[in-house]
Interface confidence: low
């Protein structure tokens, strides 16, 4: 079978991949060699992690590795007629595309001296045990398989591929996803460092919901031993987030307006360089022996150097490469550290801000806060959340539980609010009476009144007619009957203007005049409630229609 | 408010040297980054120079690098222009700027004019 | 350095009118374009951030398009109010660049 699932490490100026399938060491190194590399070489220490660090990823997305031990090849091969010869650290192998002896080995036992025929390496991984960087990979010598014999293979192999330089990952200021597609033809979108003539793919945004912005950008050689994207800033800038997403994709500082806008900056010491977010020691070596982003600080009188890391790095054991420490592990924030390249961040859980004593504190937000609050009207801090309110007459509504909505209490649940006429008003309602009757001082009652007449008015003009709108806008009262127990209303009156006595102890309007000058009414045809004869009228009385309502300063017409 | 208020502009002779001031106030000075923009008498409106937050990175534009050079007092809520070996085509309004999203807040501008 | 070219140079309308204002830049900015408003008499002011991200304040008549090269503002019924110069200028890579204007003015 071919080459299936791979994983991928880059790391200085080497990318390695890992591959399962049942191929002959042979047919491992044609795979490796069509995509322009070789069966991994393992030179050092160092080489032997980044090697362990690809198996670990291969094998974490592959389940059909079910054998206690596995074997993956390695360019590690002696030649038939070439004999071991014990007095090397390679024991007479040499590594596939050439390279000088090397002095790290790491055979897994003794090995039998046998010159017949050609031995292949393979590195030795126990599945039972966890991978660790104390624990690396054992090398095993033997056959080197035959091609198209999948039964006498072993399980997979490691390619590595070698390039001038990388460029740096791109940095994301915004929510979006990153497709790196490596001269090697593998996809990935979290690369450590992505190889020479590398193409990304950026598509902006956090999913369905947004529409996405696509950005192509390919991995080029801006100077000597200089890589770059030839992009400027952080992408897929969001003021949403500010610098709190991936440090707004700022290599060392970010530094937020108020407004969510951001900028990158760098420390003393370092500028900023063009790309707008990577910083650069102020002072470089002209030569620069280092690499990985060391920086090459010269010693007294010019003579000598020594590499430098950025703060949240550190040398390795070359003491010419800088790894990115795990600042996370000394848990230096009260509630979430994300580990960045050179650092880390604190961040702090929904509902709560950057602040508070000591670094990487977090306190609660208060979305209540004048100017900043989500509610509609009333609005409570709790820590980490908060929730709406609203003032009587209304209920929640939106779908997030912040806007206030009108409650139509003449349509209400708890039944009719009024013995005959209801008008609903925002926030509110009034009753009302049909002509020849007044409102009680309950407010909610009729009791027989003076009948004027005057001139019949019918509905409002058209251009008081409209929808019912939000809790923003003003209201129209409008008039509903109140129902009788069959549900049915028993009689439509018509309206006219009011012409009541100067002594008469309530105010009245017609229907029209209730609504605010300018804004959107609803006109409903008001009709009589059945009720019972203790409790208003039963028939009107007469034929004048004037409506009186009580005044919104009237307290039994009100919740 | 955000108020950024400029100063210091005037009639100056050719290869002579002004320095244009900018009270700001509103807004916490220390945490922005702020420019300065210049509008010729054409209406062209050309970014001259940006000083990071806290004074240690300035941008300047290519015509203008080694001439001016932009500085801020933080204590003062101040940001500064120092110009000098002036030339013809630095006849403009210099505006005021603070750094967001874009130039999110201006000044009135002050006017500099170089005569022979 | 990158140009912006900005085009009409003027615009003649009438209040009502609706119009879409174009901004070319010489490569590609990403989104990392803004435009500005400015009055006769008056200091510019910012109107649309990232091509197409309104600000508070700014009348929702306002809007952005455009990624990459091609950018356009677009006006939703011209008030008398909105006559002036329009400034496009990108964020995208030093030296931070305007475009040249386009001028509204009333037919």
């Known amino acids: 079978t071919g080459a299936d699932t791979e994983a991928v490490v880059c790391v200085g100026t080497a990318c390695y991949t890992a591959h399962s399938g049942k191929l002959s060491a042979a047919e491992a190194q044609n795979h490796c060699n069509q995509n322009g590399g070789n069966l991994a070489t393992v030179k050092s220490k160092e080489e032997a992690q980044h090697v362990q660090r690809v198996l670990a990823q291969l094998l974490r997305r592959e389940a059909a590795l079910t054998a206690r031990m596995s074997k993956f090849w390695i360019g590690l091969q002696r030649e038939k007629g070439k004999c071991l010869d014990p007095s090397l650290p390679l024991k007479g192998f040499s590594w596939v595309g050439g390279g000088e002896d090397t002095p790290y080995s790491n055979w897994h036992k003794e090995l039998r001296n046998s010159c017949i025929s050609k031995r292949c390496v393979s590195l030795l991984l126990d599945l039972s045990q966890p991978l660790l960087p104390s624990r690396l990979p054992k090398w095993s010598e033997g056959p080197c398989g035959s091609p198209g014999s999948p039964g006498s293979n072993i399980e997979g192999f490691v390619c590595k591929f070698s390039f001038k330089g990388m460029c740096r990952p791109l940095a994301l200021g915004g929510p979006g996803q990153v497709t790196y597609t490596t001269p090697f033809q593998t996809t990935s979108s979290s690369l450590e460092a992505v190889p020479f003539a590398s193409a990304a793919n950026v598509a902006c945004g956090e999913g369905d919901k947004d529409e996405t912005q696509s950005h192509y950008f390919l991995c080029k050689e801006k100077a000597p031993d200089v890589f770059d994207w030839g992009s400027s800033g952080p992408l897929c800038v969001s003021p949403k987030y500010g610098c709190n997403f991936n440090n707004g994709g700022c290599h060392q500082d970010c530094f937020e307006g108020g407004d969510g806008s951001f900028l990158c900056g760098c420390r003393p010491g370092f500028r900023l360089l063009d790309d707008l977010v990577t910083c650069a020691s102020r002072n470089p070596c002209s030569s620069s022996p280092c690499r990985g982003g060391a920086t090459c600080v010269l010693g007294p009188h010019g003579k000598n150097y020594t590499c430098r890391c950025p703060q949240g790095y550190q040398l390795d054991s070359s003491q010419l490469d800088c790894v990115d420490v795990d600042e996370c592990q000394d848990s230096p924030c009260a509630q979430e550290c994300v580990n960045t390249p050179g650092g880390f961040r604190c961040e702090c859980w929904v509902g709560y801000e950057p602040g508070g004593p000591g670094e990487g504190a977090c306190q609660d937000v208060d979305e209540c806060a004048l100017g900043r609050s989500p509610c509609a009207q009333g609005c409570t801090n709790t820590d980490g959340s908060f929730h709406c309110s609203c003032e009587e007459g209304y209920v929640l509504a939106g779908e997030d539980g912040t806007q206030c909505q009108d409650v139509d209490e003449c349509v209400g649940p708890g039944g009719p609010l009024c013995d005959s006429l209801c008008f609903n008003t925002q926030g509110s309602f009034h009753c009302g009476c049909l002509p020849g009757w007044v409102l009680a001082p309950n407010g909610v009652s009729c009791t027989m009144g003076p009948v004027s007449l005057g001139p019949p008015s019918g509905p409002p003009d058209e251009e008081d007619k409209g929808e019912k709108e939000g809790s923003t806008v003003p209201r129209a009262a409008t008039a509903s009957p109140t129902r009788g127990p069959e549900g049915t209303p028993k009689a439509t009156p018509t309206t006219s203007r009011p012409s009541l006595s100067s002594d008469a102890p309530i105010t009245s309007a017609p229907l029209k005049m209730l609504a605010p000058s300018g804004s959107p009414g609803v006109w409903r045809e008001p009709s009589i409630h059945h009720a019972t004869a203790a409790s208003g009228p039963q028939e009107p009385a007469g034929g004048d229609s004037s409506v009186a309502t009580q005044n919104n300063d009237g307290t039994d017409g009100q919740k | 408010d955000v108020n950024l208020v400029e100063s210091g502009g005037g009639l100056v002779k050719l290869g002579g040297s002004l320095k244009l001031s900018c009270a700001a106030s509103?807004?916490?000075?220390?945490?922005?980054?702020m420019s300065w923009v210049r509008q010729s008498p054409e209406k062209r409106l050309e970014w001259v120079a940006t000083?990071?937050?806290?004074?240690?990175?300035?941008y300047y534009l290519d015509t203008v690098k080694g001439r001016f050079t932009i500085s801020r007092d933080s204590a003062e809520n101040t940001l500064y222009l120092q110009m000098s070996s002036l030339i013809s085509e630095d006849t403009a309004v210099y505006y005021c700027?603070?750094?967001?999203?874009?130039?999110?807040?201006w000044g009135q501008g002050t006017l500099v004019t170089v005569s022979a | 350095d990158i140009v912006l070219t900005q085009s009409p140079a003027t615009l003649s309308v009438t209040p009502g009118d609706s119009v879409s204002l174009s901004c070319r830049a010489s490569?590609?900015?990403?989104?990392?374009l803004h435009w500005y408003q400015q009055r006769s008499h008056e200091s510019p002011r910012l109107l649309i951030k990232?091509?197409?991200q309104s600000i508070s304040d700014i009348p929702s008549r306002f809007s952005g398009s455009g990624s990459g090269t091609d950018f356009t503002l677009s006006i939703n019924s011209i008030e008398t109010e909105d006559f002036g110069m329009y400034f496009c200028?990108?964020?995208?890579?030093?030296?931070?660049?305007f475009g040249a204007g386009t001028k509204l003015e009333l037919k």
């Open positions: 700027t603070r750094v967001g999203t874009g130039f999110t807040y």
């Open positions: 509103g807004f916490t000075f220390s945490n922005y980054y």
């Open positions: 000083i990071s937050n806290n004074g240690d990175s300035t």
């Open positions: 490569q590609s900015i990403n989104n990392y």
């Open positions: 990232f091509a197409s």
């Open positions: 200028q990108q964020s995208n890579s030093w030296p931070l660049t």
